[in-house]
Interface confidence: low
């Protein structure tokens, strides 16, 4: 392949270079020079849940050649490069995003991050962005959706009119119910008995730590929280844990109940201002053996 001067001729090449300043290719924002810009807003924050996947975006604006961008995590006054972590580029019409992937988010991912770009031997650093990670107990032990669906639990959904009194009333009713039907226990079919025992045993074997999660969006607090770019909203999750009564013997009647744990938003108390709590749901199972 012929070189550029050979194709253009020396005179034509001169005019190309002469015209370059008048072309708008150096401009990124009108009169501003075409420097790389990293659009992470100062004081930006993300509240995320441990166990979830998360993508941390570094919006990058460049003109011709895409710069080499890296992520680092702040540790005191130094920023430790995250070279072994999965990253990717997302290209859009006017801006590109250099993404740091969390698959999934771990509790120790809590902290401040910064992206930096090498551009024409200059190092350009972004503002830092902070991840607030809310830890969820036994996030790795959650049953799959299929597993949850296959469990033949009879759930009586009770209106959340008052947590503890309702629970006590439910337990009392169940106790009376069990007492009333104690004489008729032998009349239960083998199949039903086996099925319910199986559920009870399955629950015990897993220490009954099943969790379901639901997403809800919470508005940013009215103090000066930045970007929350994007952002401007963060995801808060509520975990529900299923418990069995550990004091019951294997083949005795038992109660399994579920209660919702409302997760408190992490270290930044400012974020909790506009959170509306969802009603607590209680479900009970009358287990007969």
């Amino acid at each position: 392949m012929k070189t550029l001067p050979a194709m253009l001729g020396t005179g034509k090449l001169f005019w190309v270079f002469f015209l370059i300043p008048y072309l708008d290719i150096w401009n990124i924002h009108g009169k501003e020079s075409c420097d790389v810009q990293l659009y992470i807003k100062r004081q930006s924050e993300h509240s995320i849940l441990a166990g979830d996947p998360f993508e941390l975006e570094c919006p990058v604006k460049y003109c011709a050649n895409r710069p080499h961008v890296t992520w680092c995590k702040l540790n005191g006054t130094t920023c430790v490069k995250l070279e072994d972590r999965q990253t990717s580029w997302k290209e859009e019409k006017n801006i590109s995003f250099f993404i740091l992937h969390f698959e999934p988010v771990l509790p120790n991912d809590n902290g401040s991050y910064r992206c930096s770009a090498n551009f024409q031997s200059n190092l350009i650093e972004s503002h830092s962005t902070t991840l607030y990670v809310t830890d969820v107990k036994s996030a790795s032990e959650r049953p799959s959706k299929d597993e949850m669906a296959s469990r033949p639990w009879l759930l009586y959904r009770l209106l959340p009119l008052g947590g503890l009194p309702l629970l006590i009333t439910t337990c009392f009713c169940l106790f009376c119910c069990l007492r009333r039907h104690q004489g008729k226990q032998n009349e239960l079919s083998d199949t039903a008995g086996r099925e319910i025992n199986l559920v009870d045993a399955h629950l015990k074997s897993e220490q009954t730590e099943a969790s379901t999660r639901q997403n809800s969006q919470v508005l940013l607090s009215e103090t000066g929280i930045y970007d929350n770019d994007p952002d401007l909203c963060f995801r808060m999750q509520e975990g529900s844990e299923v418990y069995s009564n550990p004091c019951l013997e294997e083949n005795k009647p038992g109660i399994v109940y579920a209660s919702l744990n409302h997760s408190v938003i992490g270290p930044n108390s400012r974020l909790a201002r506009n959170v509306k709590e969802a009603p607590t749901e209680y479900a009970s199972i009358c287990v007969r053996s």
């Epitope: 924002h29 810009q37 659009y39 100062r42 919006p59 604006k61 019409k93 350009i124 972004s126 009215e222």
Partner: antibody
Framework: EVQLQESGPSLVKPSQTLSLTCSVT????????WNWIRKFPGNKLEYMGY???????YYNPSLKSRISITRDTSKNQYYLQLNSVTTEDTATYYC??????????????WGQGTSVTVSS | DVQITQSPSYLAASPGETISINCRAS??????LAWYQEKPGKTNKLLIY???TLQSGIPSRFSGSGSGTDFTLTISSLEPEDFAMYYC?????????FGGGTKLEIK
């Protein structure tokens, strides 16, 4: 050069909705933050809110129940809607770009402003 | 909200003089204060951001200083085109707030 131009009715009746458009040239509204500010008679300036490159918004709490900022990226325009206006909303309305990056952050480009009178 | 008190609200000076305009925040805003110039029929011009950084294209006779709660805009050797309205604005936390303005007039 980045230019912003406000447009909309100069007279709005009380209890009606004030609707303004900011047309942007020289930059894309899919980068940066795009703001609305107003100046009351007597020169008091009030920050109203922003629309970000991603489409997220922030509204001044004093206006939260009445304000909406939206955009049309194909036209490179963003909009202000202020519901249930009163004579207190009589002001000059400005749109401005908030530029932020590795080097600096500030509202570096403003529109000329459009004067809106709320009167019956 | 952060309250910004700007003083004086009116200032008369002659070309060649040096003047100062002050802004005080109701609480610390770190270094995040910007200064703007407003002229009739023109768009607002950013002069200073982050307390002391001169915006590109602004003459060096404009300077900003201060951090925390107290900030000053100084214009040395006033030029005829400097007579205008000046505002300060904190950009440390939302909602951003402005000073009441200073009208700089020719004496």
């Amino acid at each position: 050069e980045v230019q912003l131009q406000e447009s909309g009715p100069s007279l709005v009746k009380p209890s009606q909705t004030l609707s303004l458009t900011c047309s942007v040239t020289g930059d894309s509204i899919t980068s940066g933050y795009w703001n609305w500010i107003r100046k009351f008679p007597g020169n008091k300036l009030e920050y109203m809110g922003y629309l970000s490159y991603s489409g997220s918004t922030y509204y001044n709490p004093s206006l939260k129940s009445r304000i909406s900022i939206t955009r049309d990226t194909s036209k490179n325009q963003y909009y202000l809607q202020l519901n249930s206006v009163t004579t207190e909303d009589t002001a000059t309305y400005y749109c401005a770009r908030y530029f932020y990056g590795s080097y600096y952050e500030a509202m570096d480009y403003w529109g000329q402003g459009t004067s809106v009178t709320v009167s019956s | 909200d952060v309250q910004i008190t700007q003083s004086p609200s009116y200032l008369a000076a002659s070309p060649g003089e040096t003047i100062s305009i002050n802004c005080r925040a109701s609480k610390s805003i770190s270094k995040y204060l910007a200064w703007y110039q407003e002229k009739p029929g023109k768009t607002n011009k950013l002069l200073i951001y982050s307390g002391s950084t001169l915006q590109s294209g602004i003459p060096s006779r404009f300077s900003g200083s201060g951090s925390g709660t107290d900030f000053t805009l100084t214009i040395s050797s006033l030029e005829p085109e400097d007579f205008a309205m000046y505002y300060c604005q904190q950009h440390n936390e939302y909602p951003w707030t402005f000073g009441g303005g200073t009208k700089l007039e020719i004496k």
